[in-house]
Interface confidence: low
């Protein structure tokens, strides 16, 4: 089958340079897994001997034999054994090492359609222009920020191709990047050079703090000289506090002498004192909390006459090695409800988080779960993906623990937990979840939300889709179209207004014959290659009364991208005096291709096309 | 660049009323989250209160809900404060803040997560 063309990231008007071999084909010379390897998963690898080769069905082989498969045997495959290979690997969650990968990655030798069923780091090793076109490159790299990005070091050419085709897929041109990117490049976005550093520090910084390996230079030095230069987003040095460094926490090797003079003195002593003090802020929680536990509580014999017969005020006077040795975990297990209602110290929390990990090392039962209350603030998120929570009731008495707070870890996994048991987000589940976070559905990744039914777009108000970026909307849209597919013109538009960020051209043309009157805040919110398509007369028709705020907007996109795609004269009819049409005897040359990258079209000058016309006045004289 | 300018601060009774504004130029503020922070002398900025693009979903300190209403107009470019059954313990220098959208692994009371600042405007309540 012919793979698609290779294309140059940013190519100029030029003919992008043709070629169609995309994935390099390595004959790998294939050592078989080291013990290190098998003991990653506690599995020893079972010799293959041709396994694979013909079995009944590969998705029957256990874990331990598809552990060890060697290259060799994968060569032989068909690229249909392959991918089946590939996806019991994913489903049978084994760890493969960066050659197994690499090696799969080479045998799937045309671009694999469901991604979402292939080993995620699998993606890592496949070539990101096998997936041109908007859609493809978009479901690629939605499913590569989940990927661990850190399997390949810096310098590998698989992780240094993926950065400049994932710019390309998202639109960013220049070094201006939005948050709404940097969220979207996820891990990816720990590579990007200084330049994008310098001129996006205000929503790269806050990123670049939780990059796992160090920075390089050149994104060192940018960031010092952004820090130094005291803009957004922690602004000058001389105003920091503590909760600024840390939120800096990541950065801060790279501050160097000049900057931490300008920070005030105080503020550095009393950051250092807290740090040094409490080391949680730099580790995960759970490694300190359990091995200083375990030295402080020692398993010591309750003194007599305390023994515990029930959960009550009298618990809060007793030491924690106390508590330890008289409170029955079983007890406490069945008196839960009473916790909430006694004011115990987070230390003596702690002791009784202890003895129900001990009571369910395999995870709590949901009637326990119900009654945490405050103790599910002590929980980590390992601890909760060992739930299994079903009942609506359960999830709305722990929301209301954190209610008024952010949404934690705890909670997002609390929530994933919940939505993967039910299978889906049906509308009571979102009536829930937004009503306590009205950011909610656009916490969500385009994946997660093609689990919700059209059913459920009922529940959904416009403020819950106030954070929602356009990948977002790319996947609500459809939903809603279908929701309220059945309701009347005004009515309908009243509905589909908060998600036509996710809507194509044809939509817009057809909402631009319905004298819908749009306001400029929902129409700067279009998708802009969604806009550019659309006339003078259409965008007229779809803003009606609110066509004259085009003027405020013609700088911002996509007013300013759309104004670049149409001709001057037509702009001109409008009487808003709007500039930077195309000119008149200027030739629109519409190389989608290029297009497809720039966003803008090509121009030939009026030398060029004199020469167009003279050839075209020619063959008709002829 | 947005340019934030607050405005309407002033000295009022202990119970009374008021209504800050914080105007914006440089470019539309239907992108940006909108936050009011205010700060007492030798103090860190204190959050308010926040507001989502739309409008439609409002954030406030413990200290002020029920008392203080965040609201905005996207076509004026102005977002608003107002604050009622004000206390002494109100009085400081409010500001108004923007950032570029919400993020949720990022605090909206976290001063250090808005992108753009006002040059405040002194609020004092007198007993």
């Known amino acids: 089958m012919a793979l698609p063309t290779a294309r140059p990231l940013l190519g100029s008007c030029g003919t992008p340079a043709l070629g169609s071999l995309l994935f390099l084909l390595f004959s790998l010379g294939w050592v078989q897994p080291s013990r290190t390897l098998a003991g990653e998963t506690g599995q020893e690898a079972a010799p293959l001997d041709g396994v694979l080769a013909n079995p009944p069905n590969i998705s029957s082989l256990s874990p331990r034999q598809l552990l060890g498969f060697p290259c060799a045997e994968v060569s032989g495959l068909s690229t249909e054994r392959v991918r089946e290979l590939a996806v019991a690997l994913a489903q049978k969650n084994v760890k493969l090492s960066t050659e197994q990968l690499r090696c799969l990655a080479h045998r799937l030798s045309e671009p694999p359609e469901d991604l979402d069923a292939l080993p995620l780091d699998l993606l890592l090793f496949l070539n990101p222009d096998a997936f041109s076109g908007p859609q493809a490159c978009t479901r690629f790299f939605s499913r590569i920020t989940k990927a661990n990005v850190d399997l390949l070091p810096r310098g590998a050419p698989e992780r240094q191709r993926l950065l400049p085709a994932a710019l390309a897929c998202w639109g960013v041109r220049g070094s201006l990047l939005s948050e709404a990117d940097v969220r979207a490049l996820g891990g990816l976005a720990c590579d990007l050079p200084g330049r994008f550093v310098a001129e996006s520090a205000e929503v790269l910084l806050p990123r670049l703090v939780s990059c796992p390996g160090p920075l390089d230079q050149d994104q060192q030095e940018a960031a010092r000289a952004a820090l130094q230069g005291g803009g957004p987003p922690y602004g000058p040095p001389s105003t920091w506090s503590v909760s600024t460094m840390d939120a800096l926490r990541g950065l801060l090797p790279v501050l160097g002498q000049p900057i931490i003079r300008s920070i005030p003195q105080g503020i550095v002593a009393a950051w250092r004192q807290r740090s040094s003090r409490d080391p949680s802020w730099r580790q995960p929680e759970r490694t300190i909390l359990r091995p200083r536990f375990r030295r402080e509580v020692e398993k010591t014999a309750c003194p007599s006459g305390k023994k515990a017969r029930e959960i009550d005020e009298s618990l809060i006077f007793y030491k924690k090695w106390e508590l330890e040795a008289c409170v029955d975990a079983a007890l406490l297990a069945t008196q839960m409800d009473r916790v909430n209602a006694i004011p115990f110290t987070y230390e003596q929390l702690d002791v009784l988080k202890h003895k129900l990990d001990e009571l369910y090392p395999q995870g709590y039962p949901e009637s326990v779960i119900q009654h945490l209350g405050y103790l599910f603030l002590k929980m980590s998120p390992e601890d909760i993906r060992k739930w299994n929570v079903t009942s609506l009731e359960t999830l709305k008495a722990l929301l209301e623990v954190n209610k008024g707070h952010e949404m934690s870890p705890q909670v997002a996994t609390l929530i994933d937990r919940f939505v993967k048991g039910r299978g889906q987000l049906d509308k009571d589940t979102l009536d829930t979840l937004t009503a306590f976070y009205p950011g909610y559905l656009c916490s969500l990744s385009p994946e997660e939300l093609s689990s919700v039914p059209p059913s459920s777009i009922w529940a959904v108000r416009p403020q819950d889709l106030d954070t929602c970026d356009p990948r977002q909307l790319d996947v609500l849209y459809p939903k809603a179209r279908l929701a309220f597919q059945n309701m009347n013109g005004s009515e309908y538009f009243v509905k589909i207004q908060s998600f036509l960020g996710g809507a194509p051209t044809e939509d817009l043309k057809a909402l631009s014959q319905q004298n819908v009157s749009m306001d400029l805040a929902t129409f700067m919110k279009l998708r802009t290659d969604a806009v550019l398509p659309l006339t003078v007369a259409e965008v007229q028709k779809l803003l009606g009364p609110h066509v004259e705020g085009l003027k405020a907007e013609e700088r911002h996109r996509p007013v300013r991208d759309w104004i670049l795609r149409q001709r001057q004269d037509d702009l001109d009819t409008l009487g808003l005096g709007l500039q930077g049409g195309i000119p008149n005897g200027y030739l629109v040359l519409d190389l989608s291709m290029q297009e497809a990258l720039s966003g803008t079209p090509c121009l030939l000058g009026p030398g060029p096309v004199l020469t167009v016309l003279a050839l075209l006045l020619a063959s008709t004289l002829a | 660049q947005v340019k934030l300018e607050e405005s309407g601060g002033g000295l009022v009774q202990a119970g009374g009323s008021l209504r800050i504004s914080c105007a914006a130029s440089?470019?539309?503020?239907?992108?940006?989250?909108m936050g009011w922070f205010r700060q007492t002398p030798g103090k860190e900025r204190e959050f308010v209160a926040a507001?989502?693009?739309?409008?439609?979903?409002?954030y406030y300190a413990d200290s002020v809900k029920g008392r203080f209403t965040i609201s905005r107009d996207n076509a004026k470019n102005t977002g608003y404060l107002q604050m009622n059954s004000l206390k002494p313990e109100d009085t400081a220098v409010y500001f108004c803040?923007?950032?570029?959208?919400?993020?949720?692994?990022?605090?909206?009371?976290?001063?250090?997560?808005?992108?753009?600042w006002g040059q405040g405007t002194q609020v004092t309540v007198s007993s």
């Open positions: 803040a923007a950032r570029l959208s919400y993020d949720s692994r990022t605090s909206l009371q976290n001063s250090y997560d808005y992108n753009y």
């Open positions: 440089g470019r539309s503020i239907s992108d940006y989250f």
């Open positions: 507001i989502s693009w739309s409008g439609g979903t409002a």
